[in-house]
Structures are given as C-alpha cells and as structure tokens.
C-alpha cells in the first residue's frame, strides 16, 4: 500500500538556468487532490523549494512568486525549476501526497540530481 | 529556534470539553502538517489526529473520531485540539508535533496532561 | 491500518555493550517511510532515524538503522549512560500514523 514515486536520476540545466523533470506516482487510492512538494537536500539539511496543491483533472497552481512551474497528467506531474544558477546545483527530490479523501498517503522519490552551469560571459567585442 | 509549546491540560470530568494549544516559533508553521500524539500513564505513543498546511484536511484515529476537532490558525502559528464527550481513557499527556519536511516527526513539544476523572 | 510490533519488550544490557532492537510491521512498509524514536522518563520523544536508516540532525553515528519490507532494526553500537530510553519505531508513509508499543533498553 506504500506510494511510489519515480523520477529522472540526473538533469542539466539548460543556459538559461531553466531546469525540467517528471515526477510519477503509483497511486495506492483514488486521490481527488493531491500535493506536490519540491525538495532540495544539501548535506543532511532538507529544504523546500516549492509545493502545489492541485484537483486531479485540473492544473497545478504554485504561488505566483515561485520559482516552480507545473502541469499534471494522470498520475504524472511535469515540473519546472527557473532561475537556477550554479550554485543551485543538487539533489532535488520530489515528494507526492494525496490529501483527500482518506486515507493520506505520502511517496518520495530518490531525487533528480540537477546540474546548473552559469554561462560563460560573453566577450567584449572591439 | 525551533520551538513547540502545549498548553491547556487539566483535570476534566467524563463527558466534558477540553482545547489544547500549540504554540509554535521558529520555522514557517504554513508550511508543514501539524499532528496530536498522546501516552497514557505508563503505556506507549498513540497517534490521534493531523492538520494539513493550510487546514482544509485532517485526519483522526478511531478511537477519537467525532469526539475530537483538530483546528489551526496559521496566522497566529498555532495549532489546537478541541476534546468534546471526554472519557476516562483519554488520560494521557498530549503532545503535539510537526511533520518534518521528509515525513517523519522531527520537532515535539514538551506535552500537556489531560486527566478525565469524576 | 499497519500494525507495529517491537522485540523485546525490555532490552537488559551494560554500558559499552551493542544493543539490537527489531520492528516488524503488519504489511509491507517502503522502507523510506519507517522511523525510530527514543524518549527518556518525563520527556518528549526525539527522532532519531527517519527513512529506516538516515540519522536525524544531531544524532550520533552509534545509533544506526537497517531493514526493508516487513523487518527493520535499530542498532545501537556502544551503549551511553543516556542511552536508556524507551525506543519506538512508527511508520508514517499512510495514515492512520501507527507506533509500535516500544523497546525498553535498561542497564543490567
């Protein structure tokens, strides 16, 4: 009766700071709402990054100061990280719940680990 | 730091109502579910209800299903248990705790005893 | 709901020595959603390992965990003076959230 979670072991960022995965559940009950939380684990310490909460059919809704996007699929949620920067690099993990109806229900993946690059300047041209 | 206090115990006749509080300080308390645990006199942790971000969902043990409300105002970072029909069995210390960010229970509060005695 | 057992009841050891708790579980638990507690007389509980075998922050490396499915086990390597507590093990990946009824490890 555990949920599991899958997602990619490792993404690269593209130039613009801009990275994307899925995260997909096996959903043990027939969930109408459901919780998606991004988090990011550096050392031992675990942070949140982002978090929505969304009606199965409908669209994911993060605040509007977030730096998560969403759209959700079945049991499939495609996430996206904007603004990342090089020292944004690590293990990004993504943890599902079904809030309702009962019971709750909770799955964390193994982690995506994300790599950001800064782009190299560019060089004065004379 | 991170801190939870309880408070509202007492010694309470069967039948009647009891509210505990739970006052929490130093994390963003919106950001995390929110649970009541309690432990009778010599026995072991019982889990009794949890509180969901923003409050719209909760969830209770069977043994205090529709006795007990589990409330939260996030504006005030404070979490409460309001105990209704008490019974003699519901003696224990009451503690609250928060749900950690990867599930398990990582901040407790010092806990709050609850004695229902005619 | 998932039911908890813990063995033994009461744990009787020295200082110095390795103490083996064991929790088995009802149903299959992930092994990602199983952790263990310690609480001493008149105190809160404190976590001490959460996913089965990740220490919690500031919990020394002596205490250890292990297991998957059905069967995990705490272990603690050499026993401290205040390593005699009352341990419990819970799983919290559905609810209802269920502890198992406890481990007393007592000094012999």
């Known amino acids: 009766k555990a949920m599991h979670v899958a997602q990619p072991a490792v993404v690269l960022a593209n130039s613009r700071g801009t990275a994307s995965f899925v995260c997909e559940y096996a959903s043990p009950g027939k969930a109408t709402e459901v919780r998606v939380t991004v988090l990011r684990q550096a050392d031992s310490q675990v942070t949140e990054v982002c978090a929505a909460t969304y009606m199965m059919g409908n669209e994911l809704t993060f605040l509007d100061d977030s730096i998560c996007t969403g759209t959700s699929s079945g049991n499939q949620v495609n996430l996206t990280i904007q603004g990342l920067r090089a020292m944004d690099t690590g293990l990004y993990i993504c943890k599902v719940e079904l809030m309702y109806p009962p019971p709750y229900y909770m799955g964390i993946g193994n982690g995506t680990q994300i790599y950001v690059i800064d782009p190299e300047p560019c060089p004065d041209s004379d | 730091q991170v801190q939870l206090v309880e408070s509202g115990g007492g010694v309470v006749q069967p039948g009647r109502s009891l509210r505990l509080s739970c006052a929490a300080s130093?994390?963003?308390?919106?950001?995390?579910?929110m649970h009541w645990v309690r432990q009778a006199p010599g026995k072991g942790l019982e889990w009794v209800a949890v509180?969901?971000?923003?409050?719209?969902?909760?969830h209770y043990a069977d043994s205090v299903k529709g006795r007990f409300t589990i409330s939260r105002d996030n504006s005030k970072n404070t979490l409460y248990l309001q105990m209704n029909s008490l019974r003699a069995e519901d003696t224990a210390v009451y503690y609250c705790a928060r749900n950690g960010l990867i599930g398990a229970f990582d901040i407790w509060g010092q806990g709050t005893m609850v004695t229902v005695s005619s | 709901e998932i039911v908890l057992t813990q063995s033994p009841g009461t744990l009787s050891l020295s200082p110095g020595e390795r103490a083996t708790l064991s929790c088995r579980a009802s149903q299959s638990v992930s092994s990602s959603y199983l952790a263990w507690y310690q609480q001493k007389p008149g105190q809160a509980p404190r976590l001490l390992i959460y996913?089965?075998?990740s220490r919690a922050t500031g919990i020394p490396d002596r205490f250890s965990g292990s297991g998957s499915g059905t069967d995990f086990t705490l272990t603690i390597s050499r026993l401290e003076p205040e390593d005699f507590a009352v341990y419990y093990c819970?799983?919290?990946?559905?609810?209802?959230?269920?502890f198992g009824p406890g481990t007393k490890v007592d000094i012999k």
């Open positions: 819970q799983q919290y990946g559905s609810s209802p959230f269920t």
């Open positions: 509180i969901w971000y923003d409050g719209s969902n909760k």
């Open positions: 996913g089965a075998s």
């Open positions: 130093g994390f963003t308390f919106r950001s995390y579910g």
